[in-house]
Amino acid sequence: TPEVWVQVQMEATELSSFTVHCGFLGPGSISLVTVSWGGPDGAGGTKLAVLHPELGTRQWAPARQARWETQSSISLALEDSGASSPFANTTFCCKFASFPEGSWESCGSLPPSSDPGLSAPPTPVPILRADLAGILGLSGVLLFGCGYLLHLLRRQKHRPTPRLQPSHTNSQALTAQAWAPSQASQAALHDPYATINTSFCPATLDTAHPNGWASLPTHAAHQPQGPAASASTPILARGSFVSVENGLYTQAGERPPHTGPGLTLFPDCRGPRAVEGRFGVR
Protein backbone atom coordinates (compact mmCIF):
# COMPACT_ATOMS: atom_id res chain seq x y z
CA THR A 1 0.00 0.00 0.00
CA PRO A 2 1.15 3.57 -0.61
CA GLU A 3 2.90 5.39 2.17
CA VAL A 4 3.60 8.99 3.04
CA TRP A 5 6.67 9.93 5.04
CA VAL A 6 7.21 13.19 6.88
CA GLN A 7 10.50 14.54 8.18
CA VAL A 8 10.96 17.76 10.12
CA GLN A 9 14.36 19.38 10.41
CA MET A 10 15.73 22.40 12.17
CA GLU A 11 18.21 24.25 10.00
CA ALA A 12 21.74 24.12 11.36
CA THR A 13 22.56 27.62 10.19
CA GLU A 14 19.37 29.39 11.21
CA LEU A 15 17.93 27.97 14.39
CA SER A 16 14.63 29.75 13.82
CA SER A 17 14.17 28.00 10.49
CA PHE A 18 12.52 24.65 10.03
CA THR A 19 12.10 22.51 6.95
CA VAL A 20 9.38 19.93 6.47
CA HIS A 21 10.14 17.20 3.96
CA CYS A 22 7.35 14.96 2.71
CA GLY A 23 7.37 12.14 0.24
CA PHE A 24 5.09 9.61 -1.32
CA LEU A 25 6.06 5.97 -1.76
CA GLY A 26 3.76 4.18 -4.12
CA PRO A 27 2.55 3.87 -7.68
CA GLY A 28 0.36 6.36 -9.46
CA SER A 29 0.30 10.10 -10.03
CA ILE A 30 0.19 12.90 -7.49
CA SER A 31 -2.37 15.54 -8.22
CA LEU A 32 -2.09 17.78 -5.18
CA VAL A 33 -0.04 18.02 -1.99
CA THR A 34 -1.35 19.83 1.07
CA VAL A 35 0.87 20.65 4.04
CA SER A 36 -0.70 21.62 7.36
CA TRP A 37 0.37 22.08 10.93
CA GLY A 38 -1.37 21.43 14.21
CA GLY A 39 -3.17 18.43 12.79
CA PRO A 40 -4.22 16.74 9.57
CA ASP A 41 -6.40 18.15 6.84
CA GLY A 42 -10.00 18.16 8.01
CA ALA A 43 -9.09 17.59 11.67
CA GLY A 44 -8.14 20.95 13.05
CA GLY A 45 -5.06 21.53 10.94
CA THR A 46 -4.02 24.90 9.58
CA LYS A 47 -2.89 24.95 6.00
CA LEU A 48 0.67 26.02 5.28
CA ALA A 49 1.07 25.22 1.60
CA VAL A 50 -0.61 23.61 -1.36
CA LEU A 51 1.50 22.29 -4.21
CA HIS A 52 0.10 21.46 -7.60
CA PRO A 53 2.27 19.56 -10.07
CA GLU A 54 1.40 21.92 -12.90
CA LEU A 55 -0.04 25.11 -11.50
CA GLY A 56 2.68 25.74 -8.95
CA THR A 57 2.45 26.44 -5.25
CA ARG A 58 0.49 28.50 -2.77
CA GLN A 59 1.70 29.13 0.74
CA TRP A 60 0.61 30.90 3.89
CA ALA A 61 2.62 32.35 6.74
CA PRO A 62 4.79 31.18 8.38
CA ALA A 63 5.68 29.17 5.29
CA ARG A 64 8.65 30.69 3.51
CA GLN A 65 9.18 28.48 0.46
CA ALA A 66 7.35 25.41 -0.77
CA ARG A 67 8.85 23.45 -3.62
CA TRP A 68 8.95 20.08 -5.28
CA GLU A 69 12.11 18.11 -4.59
CA THR A 70 11.26 15.19 -6.85
CA GLN A 71 8.12 14.05 -8.61
CA SER A 72 7.05 12.37 -5.40
CA SER A 73 8.45 14.57 -2.65
CA ILE A 74 8.23 18.17 -1.52
CA SER A 75 9.87 20.46 0.98
CA LEU A 76 8.50 23.40 2.89
CA ALA A 77 10.74 25.95 4.59
CA LEU A 78 9.25 27.68 7.62
CA GLU A 79 10.36 30.86 9.33
CA ASP A 80 9.83 30.79 13.08
CA SER A 81 9.67 34.41 14.12
CA GLY A 82 8.59 33.74 17.69
CA ALA A 83 11.15 33.51 20.45
CA SER A 84 9.39 30.55 22.03
CA SER A 85 9.95 28.39 18.93
CA PRO A 86 6.47 26.88 18.62
CA PHE A 87 7.54 24.64 15.74
CA ALA A 88 9.63 22.47 18.04
CA ASN A 89 6.53 20.82 19.50
CA THR A 90 4.24 21.12 16.49
CA THR A 91 2.88 18.34 14.34
CA PHE A 92 3.19 18.78 10.60
CA CYS A 93 1.04 16.79 8.21
CA CYS A 94 1.34 16.11 4.50
CA LYS A 95 -1.49 14.90 2.32
CA PHE A 96 -0.76 13.45 -1.11
CA ALA A 97 -3.76 13.17 -3.35
CA SER A 98 -4.54 11.54 -6.64
CA PHE A 99 -7.86 12.21 -8.24
CA PRO A 100 -10.00 10.20 -8.12
CA GLU A 101 -8.07 7.23 -6.71
CA GLY A 102 -7.61 8.53 -3.20
CA SER A 103 -5.49 10.50 -0.79
CA TRP A 104 -2.89 9.54 1.78
CA GLU A 105 -1.79 11.58 4.74
CA SER A 106 0.90 11.29 7.38
CA CYS A 107 2.15 13.53 10.18
CA GLY A 108 5.43 14.09 11.94
CA SER A 109 7.24 16.48 14.24
CA LEU A 110 10.75 17.47 15.17
CA PRO A 111 12.32 14.55 17.04
CA PRO A 112 13.23 15.31 20.66
CA SER A 113 16.67 13.80 20.15
CA SER A 114 19.31 15.24 17.87
CA ASP A 115 19.92 12.00 16.04
CA PRO A 116 21.64 13.06 12.81
CA GLY A 117 20.08 10.14 11.02
CA LEU A 118 16.61 11.51 11.53
CA SER A 119 16.83 15.24 11.67
CA ALA A 120 19.01 18.19 12.34
CA PRO A 121 19.53 18.78 16.06
CA PRO A 122 16.96 20.93 17.86
CA THR A 123 19.68 22.96 19.56
CA PRO A 124 22.94 24.40 18.25
CA VAL A 125 25.07 22.70 20.90
CA PRO A 126 25.66 19.37 19.12
CA ILE A 127 26.63 21.18 15.94
CA LEU A 128 29.07 23.46 17.77
CA ARG A 129 30.59 20.52 19.56
CA ALA A 130 30.92 18.55 16.40
CA ASP A 131 32.56 21.46 14.65
CA LEU A 132 34.82 22.08 17.60
CA ALA A 133 35.81 18.44 17.78
CA GLY A 134 36.55 18.45 14.08
CA ILE A 135 38.66 21.58 14.29
CA LEU A 136 40.54 20.41 17.37
CA GLY A 137 41.05 16.98 15.91
CA LEU A 138 42.34 18.34 12.65
CA SER A 139 44.58 20.80 14.45
CA GLY A 140 45.92 18.04 16.61
CA VAL A 141 46.69 15.84 13.64
CA LEU A 142 48.38 18.72 11.84
CA LEU A 143 50.42 19.66 14.90
CA PHE A 144 51.41 16.07 15.45
CA GLY A 145 52.36 15.74 11.79
CA CYS A 146 54.43 18.90 11.86
CA GLY A 147 56.17 17.82 15.05
CA TYR A 148 56.89 14.41 13.59
CA LEU A 149 58.30 15.95 10.40
CA LEU A 150 60.51 18.29 12.45
CA HIS A 151 61.67 15.31 14.46
CA LEU A 152 62.59 13.44 11.28
CA LEU A 153 64.43 16.46 9.88
CA ARG A 154 66.42 16.85 13.09
CA ARG A 155 67.42 13.20 13.05
CA GLN A 156 68.53 13.48 9.44
CA LYS A 157 70.61 16.58 10.18
CA HIS A 158 72.53 14.79 12.91
CA ARG A 159 73.17 11.72 10.76
CA PRO A 160 76.23 11.60 8.50
CA THR A 161 74.66 8.72 6.56
CA PRO A 162 73.03 9.30 3.18
CA ARG A 163 69.69 11.12 3.47
CA LEU A 164 66.49 9.27 2.97
CA GLN A 165 64.08 10.59 0.39
CA PRO A 166 61.12 11.95 2.35
CA SER A 167 57.83 10.35 1.40
CA HIS A 168 55.24 12.62 -0.14
CA THR A 169 52.37 13.46 2.16
CA ASN A 170 48.95 13.03 0.64
CA SER A 171 47.32 16.38 1.17
CA GLN A 172 43.91 14.81 0.73
CA ALA A 173 44.43 12.36 3.55
CA LEU A 174 43.60 14.99 6.13
CA THR A 175 40.14 16.03 5.09
CA ALA A 176 37.63 17.40 7.54
CA GLN A 177 34.22 15.91 6.95
CA ALA A 178 31.39 18.35 7.51
CA TRP A 179 28.54 17.12 9.65
CA ALA A 180 25.29 16.70 7.81
CA PRO A 181 22.08 14.90 8.69
CA SER A 182 21.61 11.73 6.73
CA GLN A 183 18.35 11.23 4.90
CA ALA A 184 17.95 7.54 5.51
CA SER A 185 14.21 7.67 5.14
CA GLN A 186 14.55 9.07 1.65
CA ALA A 187 16.73 6.28 0.35
CA ALA A 188 13.87 4.67 -1.51
CA LEU A 189 12.98 7.81 -3.41
CA HIS A 190 14.07 8.85 -6.87
CA ASP A 191 16.99 11.15 -7.31
CA PRO A 192 16.01 14.77 -7.34
CA TYR A 193 15.07 16.15 -10.70
CA ALA A 194 15.64 19.60 -12.05
CA THR A 195 12.93 22.09 -11.24
CA ILE A 196 11.04 23.59 -14.13
CA ASN A 197 9.64 27.08 -13.95
CA THR A 198 5.92 27.29 -14.39
CA SER A 199 4.88 28.09 -17.89
CA PHE A 200 1.68 27.06 -19.53
CA CYS A 201 2.48 27.23 -23.19
CA PRO A 202 3.19 23.72 -24.43
CA ALA A 203 6.02 25.06 -26.53
CA THR A 204 7.87 25.76 -23.32
CA LEU A 205 7.25 22.38 -21.76
CA ASP A 206 9.88 19.73 -22.16
CA THR A 207 7.21 17.15 -22.85
CA ALA A 208 5.17 19.16 -25.30
CA HIS A 209 4.05 17.13 -28.27
CA PRO A 210 4.39 18.32 -31.84
CA ASN A 211 0.64 18.61 -32.21
CA GLY A 212 0.41 21.19 -29.47
CA TRP A 213 -0.74 19.03 -26.59
CA ALA A 214 1.33 19.08 -23.45
CA SER A 215 1.95 16.06 -21.31
CA LEU A 216 1.67 16.15 -17.57
CA PRO A 217 3.55 13.86 -15.21
CA THR A 218 1.83 10.73 -14.01
CA HIS A 219 4.53 9.69 -11.58
CA ALA A 220 4.48 8.64 -7.96
CA ALA A 221 1.14 8.01 -6.45
CA HIS A 222 -0.95 5.14 -5.34
CA GLN A 223 -3.45 2.41 -5.80
CA PRO A 224 -7.20 2.90 -5.90
CA GLN A 225 -8.84 3.54 -2.61
CA GLY A 226 -12.10 2.14 -1.32
CA PRO A 227 -15.37 3.85 -2.07
CA ALA A 228 -15.66 5.33 1.39
CA ALA A 229 -12.38 7.15 1.29
CA SER A 230 -12.06 10.83 0.63
CA ALA A 231 -9.27 12.09 -1.56
CA SER A 232 -7.60 15.09 -3.02
CA THR A 233 -6.45 16.09 -6.47
CA PRO A 234 -5.76 18.80 -8.92
CA ILE A 235 -8.09 19.54 -11.71
CA LEU A 236 -5.50 20.28 -14.30
CA ALA A 237 -3.32 17.27 -14.08
CA ARG A 238 -6.30 15.11 -14.77
CA GLY A 239 -7.59 16.61 -17.96
CA SER A 240 -9.47 19.55 -16.57
CA PHE A 241 -9.73 23.00 -17.95
CA VAL A 242 -7.78 26.10 -17.18
CA SER A 243 -7.67 29.69 -18.22
CA VAL A 244 -4.29 31.19 -18.81
CA GLU A 245 -5.55 34.62 -19.66
CA ASN A 246 -3.51 37.62 -18.55
CA GLY A 247 -0.61 35.40 -17.57
CA LEU A 248 -2.37 34.32 -14.41
CA TYR A 249 -0.21 31.27 -13.98
CA THR A 250 3.11 32.53 -15.17
CA GLN A 251 4.29 33.11 -11.60
CA ALA A 252 2.46 30.22 -10.04
CA GLY A 253 5.57 28.60 -8.64
CA GLU A 254 7.71 25.56 -9.14
CA ARG A 255 6.69 22.27 -10.62
CA PRO A 256 8.07 18.80 -10.44
CA PRO A 257 9.97 17.66 -13.51
CA HIS A 258 8.16 16.20 -16.46
CA THR A 259 9.16 12.65 -17.12
CA GLY A 260 7.27 9.64 -18.20
CA PRO A 261 3.87 9.45 -19.85
CA GLY A 262 1.59 12.36 -19.18
CA LEU A 263 -1.92 13.61 -19.44
CA THR A 264 -3.10 16.13 -21.95
CA LEU A 265 -3.53 19.63 -20.70
CA PHE A 266 -3.59 22.28 -23.37
CA PRO A 267 -5.22 21.96 -26.75
CA ASP A 268 -3.36 24.88 -28.26
CA CYS A 269 -1.01 27.71 -27.54
CA ARG A 270 -1.85 30.34 -30.08
CA GLY A 271 -2.77 33.08 -27.69
CA PRO A 272 -4.55 34.06 -24.51
CA ARG A 273 -7.90 32.68 -25.57
CA ALA A 274 -6.57 29.48 -27.07
CA VAL A 275 -6.12 27.65 -23.77
CA GLU A 276 -9.48 28.37 -22.21
CA GLY A 277 -11.15 25.14 -23.24
CA ARG A 278 -10.73 23.00 -20.16
CA PHE A 279 -11.32 24.96 -16.98
CA GLY A 280 -11.52 28.40 -15.50
CA VAL A 281 -13.10 29.98 -18.53
CA ARG A 282 -14.63 33.33 -17.87
Epitope: S31, L32, T34, S36, D41, G42, A43, G44, G45, K47, V50, H52, L55, G56, R58, K95, A97, F99, S103, S230, A231, S232, T233, P234, I235, L236, S240, V242, S243, V244, E245, L248, Y249, A252, F279, G280, V281, R282
Partner: nanobody, 120 residues
Framework: EVQLVESGGGLVQPGGSLRLSCAAS????????MGWFRQAPGKGLEGVAH???????RYVESVKGRFTISRDNAKNSLYLQMNSLRAEDTAVYYC??????????????WGQGTMVTVSS
Protein backbone atom coordinates in the same frame (compact mmCIF):
# COMPACT_ATOMS: atom_id res chain seq x y z
CA GLU B 1 -13.00 14.17 8.22
CA VAL B 2 -14.05 15.95 5.05
CA GLN B 3 -16.99 14.31 3.36
CA LEU B 4 -18.64 15.08 0.06
CA VAL B 5 -21.73 13.13 -0.95
CA GLU B 6 -23.18 13.50 -4.43
CA SER B 7 -26.71 12.66 -5.47
CA GLY B 8 -29.11 13.25 -8.35
CA GLY B 9 -27.51 11.15 -11.05
CA GLY B 10 -29.42 8.75 -13.22
CA LEU B 11 -30.61 7.87 -16.69
CA VAL B 12 -32.05 10.63 -18.84
CA GLN B 13 -32.92 11.03 -22.50
CA PRO B 14 -31.04 13.43 -24.76
CA GLY B 15 -32.39 16.93 -24.29
CA GLY B 16 -33.50 16.15 -20.77
CA SER B 17 -32.45 17.68 -17.47
CA LEU B 18 -30.91 16.58 -14.19
CA ARG B 19 -29.94 18.37 -11.00
CA LEU B 20 -26.92 17.11 -9.11
CA SER B 21 -26.47 17.90 -5.43
CA CYS B 22 -23.43 17.68 -3.20
CA ALA B 23 -23.60 17.76 0.60
CA ALA B 24 -20.34 18.83 2.23
CA SER B 25 -19.25 18.38 5.83
CA UNK B 26 -16.17 18.26 8.00
CA UNK B 27 -14.37 21.28 6.63
CA UNK B 28 -11.69 22.99 8.63
CA UNK B 29 -9.52 24.27 5.82
CA UNK B 30 -10.60 27.49 4.19
CA UNK B 31 -10.85 26.19 0.66
CA UNK B 32 -11.28 28.67 -2.14
CA UNK B 33 -13.61 26.92 -4.52
CA MET B 34 -16.11 24.14 -5.09
CA GLY B 35 -16.81 22.49 -8.37
CA TRP B 36 -17.75 19.52 -10.48
CA PHE B 37 -15.56 17.15 -12.47
CA ARG B 38 -16.60 14.35 -14.69
CA GLN B 39 -15.04 11.23 -16.14
CA ALA B 40 -16.63 9.65 -19.18
CA PRO B 41 -16.25 5.88 -19.60
CA GLY B 42 -12.76 5.10 -20.81
CA LYS B 43 -11.73 8.73 -20.79
CA GLY B 44 -9.83 11.13 -18.57
CA LEU B 45 -11.15 13.53 -15.98
CA GLU B 46 -12.54 16.84 -17.11
CA GLY B 47 -13.45 19.89 -15.10
CA VAL B 48 -17.04 20.90 -15.73
CA ALA B 49 -17.61 24.00 -13.63
CA HIS B 50 -16.52 25.59 -10.41
CA UNK B 51 -17.62 28.46 -8.23
CA UNK B 52 -15.18 30.61 -6.29
CA UNK B 53 -15.52 31.99 -2.80
CA UNK B 54 -16.44 35.25 -4.51
CA UNK B 55 -19.47 33.47 -5.95
CA UNK B 56 -18.39 33.78 -9.58
CA UNK B 57 -19.15 30.62 -11.58
CA ARG B 58 -16.88 29.35 -14.34
CA TYR B 59 -17.66 26.71 -16.92
CA VAL B 60 -15.92 24.58 -19.46
CA GLU B 61 -16.82 25.66 -22.98
CA SER B 62 -18.78 22.51 -23.84
CA VAL B 63 -21.36 23.09 -21.11
CA LYS B 64 -21.74 26.87 -21.26
CA GLY B 65 -25.37 27.87 -21.57
CA ARG B 66 -26.57 24.39 -20.62
CA PHE B 67 -25.21 23.82 -17.10
CA THR B 68 -25.54 26.09 -14.08
CA ILE B 69 -23.49 25.73 -10.91
CA SER B 70 -24.66 27.17 -7.60
CA ARG B 71 -23.95 26.82 -3.92
CA ASP B 72 -25.89 27.22 -0.71
CA ASN B 73 -23.47 28.23 2.01
CA ALA B 74 -26.09 27.86 4.73
CA LYS B 75 -26.59 24.22 3.78
CA ASN B 76 -22.97 23.57 2.83
CA SER B 77 -24.25 22.30 -0.48
CA LEU B 78 -23.25 22.56 -4.12
CA TYR B 79 -25.53 22.04 -7.09
CA LEU B 80 -25.23 21.48 -10.82
CA GLN B 81 -28.32 22.05 -12.92
CA MET B 82 -27.84 20.25 -16.23
CA ASN B 83 -30.16 21.07 -19.12
CA SER B 84 -30.21 20.04 -22.78
CA LEU B 85 -28.19 16.97 -21.95
CA ARG B 86 -26.27 15.20 -24.70
CA ALA B 87 -24.88 11.70 -25.05
CA GLU B 88 -21.39 13.10 -24.58
CA ASP B 89 -22.38 14.30 -21.10
CA THR B 90 -22.53 10.68 -19.96
CA ALA B 91 -19.98 10.33 -17.17
CA VAL B 92 -19.37 9.93 -13.47
CA TYR B 93 -19.70 13.39 -11.91
CA TYR B 94 -17.55 14.25 -8.91
CA CYS B 95 -18.13 17.06 -6.44
CA UNK B 96 -14.84 18.68 -5.39
CA UNK B 97 -13.61 21.35 -3.03
CA UNK B 98 -10.20 22.85 -3.48
CA UNK B 99 -7.79 25.70 -3.78
CA UNK B 100 -7.58 28.35 -6.46
CA UNK B 101 -4.58 28.79 -8.68
CA UNK B 102 -5.48 31.82 -10.73
CA UNK B 103 -8.81 30.99 -12.33
CA UNK B 104 -8.27 27.32 -11.76
CA UNK B 105 -9.78 25.27 -8.93
CA UNK B 106 -7.51 22.43 -7.84
CA UNK B 107 -9.47 19.85 -5.85
CA UNK B 108 -8.32 18.99 -2.37
CA UNK B 109 -11.21 16.64 -1.58
CA TRP B 110 -13.99 15.01 -3.55
CA GLY B 111 -16.86 12.62 -3.26
CA GLN B 112 -17.40 9.15 -4.66
CA GLY B 113 -19.21 10.40 -7.73
CA THR B 114 -22.66 9.98 -9.20
CA MET B 115 -23.33 8.43 -12.59
CA VAL B 116 -25.14 10.39 -15.26
CA THR B 117 -26.23 8.45 -18.32
CA VAL B 118 -27.72 10.24 -21.32
CA SER B 119 -29.25 7.74 -23.69
CA SER B 120 -32.38 7.21 -25.69
Amino acid sequence: EVQLVESGGGLVQPGGSLRLSCAASGFTFSTDCMGWFRQAPGKGLEGVAHIDSDGIPRYVESVKGRFTISRDNAKNSLYLQMNSLRAEDTAVYYCVVGFKFGDYCAPNDWGQGTMVTVSS
